[in-house]
């Protein structure tokens, strides 16, 4: 009992004057609180609290549930307590079966005893299973059994409080421990798409997935460089113990150009934070941008293949693509495909495959593409390189020898004279006249060149060679001359094609 110092308020005194009292079930509990300023008795056990304004607390027939702490308080707020055990062999434990523990913290299994004199007060696993090896506990007959430093592995552990009574083990009702996990890593965040491209007025919706061990993870969508609170919709799931998933969906029902920017999904817990971003670009209307993958002026040798390749950005999706030549649309020989299978891809490739091109197939090849908003086109000028072909080689009435050759690039015509029967014509003869003629064929076709020399310059028998050549190859034609007296005759001309 407390000692009294004169002039200072003292705690009340309780009779019987001991800290613990043991009574048998059915016996009377009589507690007297002596204090001039008595206010109340309070009884506490587990979550239950009762009050009594009488200074004498009387329970005529004590029950096990009357076990607990009886506290007398005076008007100065000073108090004194006695703990009463109501010994009941049929009810050794008072229990509150709710059992929650925070990971790494201690938690109390609330199974106070009604008889402090029983032995081996401890915890046991259900159905004879052993407790985890690392589980440590401290028994307290008045409060229960404290489990030290709760582990995540103890989650859903089934337990009994246990005592030995007269040599036999007695178990309480079962407890199932629920462990509230501690955060030991940052949340895992991911976003449905890393970038979005929209037209004005379209709906922007993006979902952030947050994964963590519990639902107390914090998450939010933020706009970079803005404090405005964004409207989010949540869904969440408990995928088993310590596996919580939340989906935070951000929606702008009618996006505007000035909504463009970077949006961040941010999540944090007591361990740390994580974030992921998505980029929104809102355009006032769709677009198509075409990028040729080869030069738009193409030179190709006769009989060879060439691929005309474009990449293009199209938003929204391209709806019509075609390749055109000479007002004719290709139905085959071309393919069009997305640059990547990514859902947000806006880049595409189109390839026209031209095979074994003829000299007559040069010209403008046009790629056209359109979507719901715009059309776009790109033209390729294809030139087919052809070896010169000698179209005519004649002796004109005025005594001129004339050679006409066609090819691409423009052929050059050289003249040579071979005296007598020599096979090699090396002495060059300067032409009198050289002209490039307009071709009657399409543009990008062969170029025609006409060259003439004066045959009167030749005084001896021999052969005149007209040689037409360009980057691709060369072709020759020959005029044979024989003198009969003073007369010169042209013997049949012939050509010799030289690769």
């Amino acid at each position: 009992q407390p000692s009294v110092s004169p002039g200072e308020p003292s705690p009340p005194s309780i009779h019987p004057g001991k800290s613990d009292l043991i009574v048998r079930v059915g016996d009377e509990i009589r507690l007297l609180c002596t204090d001039p300023g008595f206010v109340k008795w309070t009884f506490e056990i587990l979550d239950e609290t009762n009050e009594n304004k009488q200074n004498e607390w009387i329970t005529e027939k004590a029950e096990a549930t009357n076990t607990g702490k009886y506290t007398c308080t005076n008007k100065h707020g000073l108090s004194n307590s006695i703990y009463v055990f109501v010994r009941d062999p049929a009810k050794l434990f008072l229990v509150d079966r709710s059992l929650y523990g925070k990971e790494d913290n201690d938690t109390l299994v609330r199974c106070p005893l009604t008889d402090p004199e029983v032995t081996n007060y401890s915890l046991k696993g259900c159905q004879g299973k052993p407790l985890p090896k690392d589980l440590r506990f401290i028994p307290d007959p008045k409060a229960g059994i404290m489990i030290k430093s709760v582990k995540r592995a103890y989650h859903r552990l089934c337990l009994h409080c246990s005592v030995d009574q007269e040599g036999k083990s007695v178990l309480s009702e079962k407890f199932i421990l629920k462990v509230r996990p501690a955060f030991k890593a940052v949340p895992v965040v991911s976003v449905s798409k890393a970038s979005y491209l929209l037209r004005e007025g379209e709906e922007f919706t993006v979902t952030c997935t947050i994964k963590d061990v519990s639902s107390s993870v914090y998450s939010t969508w933020k706009r970079e460089n803005s404090q405005t609170k964004l409207q989010e919709k949540y869904n969440s799931w408990h995928h088993g113990d310590f596996n919580y998933e939340r989906q935070a969906t951000l929606t702008i029902s009618s996006a505007r150009v000035n909504d463009s920017g970077v949006f961040m999904c941010y999540a944090n817990n007591t361990f740390g934070s994580a974030n992921v971003t998505t980029t929104l670009e809102v355009v006032d209307k769709g677009f198509i941008n075409i990028f040729p993958m080869i030069n738009t002026t193409v030179f190709v040798n006769d009989g060879e293949n060439v691929d005309l390749i474009v990449e293009y950005e199209a938003f929204p999706k391209p709806e019509h693509q075609q390749w055109i030549y000479m007002n004719r649309t290709f139905t085959d020989k071309w393919e069009d495909y997305p640059k990547s299978e990514n859902e947000s891809n806006i880049r595409y490739v189109s390839e026209l495959h031209l095979t074994r091109l003829k000299g007559t197939e040069g010209g403008t090849y046009t790629f056209l593409v359109s979507n719901s908003d715009v059309n776009a086109a790109i033209a390729f000028n294809v030139y087919v390189n052809t070896k010169p072909e000698i179209l005519t080689y004649d002796r004109l009435v005025n005594g001129m020898l004339q050679c006409v050759a066609a090819g691409f690039p423009e052929p050059t015509i050289d003249w040579y004279f071979c005296p007598g029967t020599e096979q090699r014509c090396s002495a060059s003869v300067l032409p009198v006249d050289v002209q490039t003629l307009n071709s009657s064929g399409p543009p990008f076709g062969k170029l025609v060149v006409q060259s003439s020399i004066d045959s009167s310059a030749f005084k001896h028998n021999g052969t005149v060679e007209c040689k037409a050549y360009n980057d691709v190859g060369k072709t020759s034609a020959y005029f044979n001359f024989a003198f009969k007296g003073n007369n010169k005759e042209q013997i049949h001309p012939h050509t010799l094609f030289t690769p």
């Epitope: 709710s98 629920k178 914090y218 998450s219 408990h238």
Partner: antibody, heavy 119, light 107 residues
């Protein structure tokens, strides 16, 4: 003793506003997610809204999204529900309920407060 | 949203009867299923959580079973104080949803 006590209910006209409070005692309030659940006269239970222990995240049923706002003041151990643009179909007893162990299991309920929306 | 369907919506039984109430989810909810009891004019009271775990203070005549989409609440021997309305609730995902209720009346 663990307890929840709602207040703030009453009669309100359609389009009007009301703020419900729920005073918590007997447990560490900030450790628990809290909820509002309602029950229209003669009908079943309908979850309305939830808020995490820190107050950082809030969740709503589609039927009240944009009109109701859940909040909490952990220093006062109090949960709130601000109800705007009230409709006749919001007439119900509103209960606050504690979520135990992170799992949206409502282990402690208040006694409820009646909200009547009528002209 | 996950729909919860309870059956029957009401039943009449006598004291001592064994009573079974079923609850079906529109998609799998694993074992995230809870049962509540509500008496007229009172707040609901948690009976069973995680499909089969008995809440502290709830008599052992109440039991729960099931997983996935089909769940059962059983009262092994009906007592006078058990006449009430019983609700199932899924806590697998938000939005949280309740069954329509089963009213247990005295025959």
């Amino acid at each position: 003793e663990v307890q929840l006590l709602e207040s703030g209910g009453g009669l309100v006209q359609p389009g009007g506003s009301l703020r419900l409070s729920c005073a918590a005692s007997g447990f560490t309030f900030s450790d628990y997610s809290m909820n509002w659940v309602r029950q229209a006269p003669g009908k079943g239970l309908e979850w309305v809204s939830a808020i995490t222990g820190s107050g950082g995240n809030t969740f709503y049923a589609d039927s009240v999204k944009g009109r109701f706002t859940i909040s909490r003041d952990n220093s006062k151990n109090t949960l709130y529900l601000q109800m705007n643009s009230l409709r006749a179909e919001d007439t119900a007893v509103y209960y606050c309920a504690r979520s135990n162990y992170e799992q949206d299991v409502f282990d402690i309920w208040g006694q409820g407060t009646l909200v009547t929306v009528s002209s | 949203d996950i729909q919860m369907t309870q059956s029957p919506s009401s039943l009449s039984a006598s004291v001592g009867d064994r009573v079974t109430i079923t609850c079906r989810a529109s998609q799998t909810i694993y074992r995230y299923l809870n049962w509540y009891q509500q008496k007229p004019g009172k707040a609901p009271k948690l009976l069973i959580y995680d499909a089969s775990d008995l809440q502290s203070g709830v008599p052992s005549r109440f039991s729960g079973s099931g997983s996935g989409t089909d769940f059962t609440l059983t009262i092994s021997s009906l007592q006078p104080e058990d006449f009430a309305t019983y609700y199932c609730q899924q806590s697998y995902s938000i939005p949280i949803t309740f069954g329509g209720g089963t009213k247990v009346e005295i025959k």
